[in-house]
């Protein structure tokens, strides 16, 4: 059902990385416009991207509230020129979204090693707590701040004169790991949440070598 | 608001398994830990373990693995813990707790009102 | 695993400003061990005051502080008053389990 020459949105995708969070959809769209709303199981609906011809919304400021909410969205399909105007059953066509509970779910961007350094036979490697657009007390909250317990990294390094990889494991931001004295080592981090069942795992990080400008040397 | 509302005392006898419930409202189930802890007089406090409703995924105490179970339904909201093989040691009062809002914060800020388990021939 | 260590019991008077630690037997306690403390009144009674070091939980009054001293969790009471007398437990985080501590007995006379 519907207006004459609109069509309902179909393939609702939510694409959410670090909580950035952009709700996506088909068809482009032929002589109509859309409206999103979002709401949570429990509230009411809130409506974001008016009348656009666009095939995509970004949600982040509303997901961003309740990150631990799970959100449900809806695309409505208007005539263009004709907003006003409704489908038989009285209201615009829509479309919903699936749910998406945005601390289950976003994806876990690509981590960054901060610096590395070695000190005899030990180096330390520090990962970068990435800032997330989730906010408390006016401040920017990290991926750690929100995440706490749940979010390990692994840390994967070898020498660079061999490719067998070694693995570890934190809690933290920080590995302190082994190495053999005069041999330089490579790194590449990833962020894990172990209690998931989708999107564990972020990308790996770029990888980063002992003896590039991003480390420190200390012989003792 | 938050509440944890567990289920009533029970009385078992040696041997036998008990299913102790705790019915979350006030909030997005799915998505806070619930953690279960045991409190015998003069023991304290003891962590049993815990589970992540909207993944099912759990962690437990070692001591405990074997003895307590963690099973969540997130369609009525509710979580709970079965103790098997119950022995004297196994009397106590049982908690659930939710954990707090953001991760730099996780731990015990909702607690139920406790289940008596009573073992006994 | 690791034990925790609170004292026992503390005496105060209203008013005054009192403060309960937390010792890990593994070394120092960091923010990485999600320090939590939690206070339970006669009948059972449980609530979160401080979880992740130092956030306060729902409703919990300003009196209530939570921070690291030295190489211990502490929580501090400014200006207790009488129906603070309660035994508080601490918590520490472990990588991958919770250990609490024997409690401390607070008594505001």
């Known amino acids: 059902s519907g207006t004459t020459n609109t069509v309902a949105a179909y393939n609702l995708t939510w694409k959410s990385t670090n909580f950035k969070t952009i709700l996506e959809w088909e068809p482009k769209p032929v002589n109509q416009v859309y409206t999103v709303q979002i709401s949570t199981k429990s509230g009411d609906w809130k409506s974001k991207c008016f009348y656009t011809t666009d095939t995509e919304c970004d949600l982040t400021d509303e997901i961003v509230k309740d990150v631990k909410q799970t959100y449900l969205a809806r695309v409505f399909s208007y005539p263009a020129g004709n907003v006003e105007s409704t489908g038989s059953a009285g209201e615009p066509l829509y479309e919903n979204s699936p749910e998406f509970t945005p601390y289950l779910e976003t994806n876990l961007g690509q981590p960054t090693i901060q610096s590395f350094e070695q000190v005899g036979t030990k180096v330390n490697v520090t990962v970068e707590d990435e800032r997330t657009l989730v906010r408390r007390n006016n401040t920017f909250l990290s991926l750690r701040d929100v995440f706490g317990k749940d979010l390990i990294y692994t840390l994967y390094y070898w020498k660079s004169s061999s490719s067998g990889k070694k693995t570890a494991k934190t809690n933290t931001n920080e590995f302190l790991i082994d190495v053999d004295k005069g041999e330089n080592y490579c790194f590449s981090v990833q962020a894990v949440i172990p209690s998931r069942t989708v999107n564990r795992k972020s990308t790996d990080s770029p990888v980063e070598c002992m003896g590039q400008e991003k480390g420190e040397f200390r012989e003792i | 608001e938050v509440q944890l509302q567990q289920s009533g005392a029970e009385l078992m006898k040696p041997g036998a398994s008990v299913k102790i419930s705790c019915k979350a409202t006030g909030y997005t189930f799915s998505s806070y830990w619930i953690e279960w802890v045991k409190q015998r007089p003069g023991h304290g406090l003891e962590w049993i373990g815990e589970?992540?409703?909207?993944?099912?995924?759990?962690k437990y105490n070692e001591k405990f693995k074997g003895k307590a179970t963690f099973t969540a339904d997130t369609s009525s909201n509710t979580a709970y813990m079965q103790l098997s093989s119950l022995t004297s040691e196994d009397s106590a009062v049982y908690y659930c707790a939710r954990d707090y809002y953001y991760g730099s914060s996780y731990g015990f800020a909702y607690w139920g009102q406790g289940t008596l388990v009573t073992v006994s021939s | 695993q690791a034990v925790v260590t609170q004292e026992s019991a503390l005496t105060t008077s209203p008013g005054e400003t009192v403060t309960l630690t937390c010792r890990s037997s593994?070394?120092?306690?960091?923010?990485?061990?999600?320090a939590n403390w939690v206070q339970e009144k006669p009948d059972h009674l449980f609530t979160g005051l401080i979880g992740g070091t130092n956030n306060r939980g729902p409703g919990v009054p300003a009196r209530f502080s939570g921070s690291l001293i030295g190489d211990k969790a502490a929580l501090t009471i400014t200006g207790a008053q009488t129906e603070d007398e309660a035994v508080y437990f601490c918590a520490l985080w472990y990588s991958n389990h919770w250990v609490f501590g024997g409690g401390t007995k607070l008594t505001v006379l």
């Open positions: 593994t070394g120092a306690v960091t923010t990485s061990n999600y």
């Open positions: 589970i992540l409703p909207g993944s099912a995924s759990t």
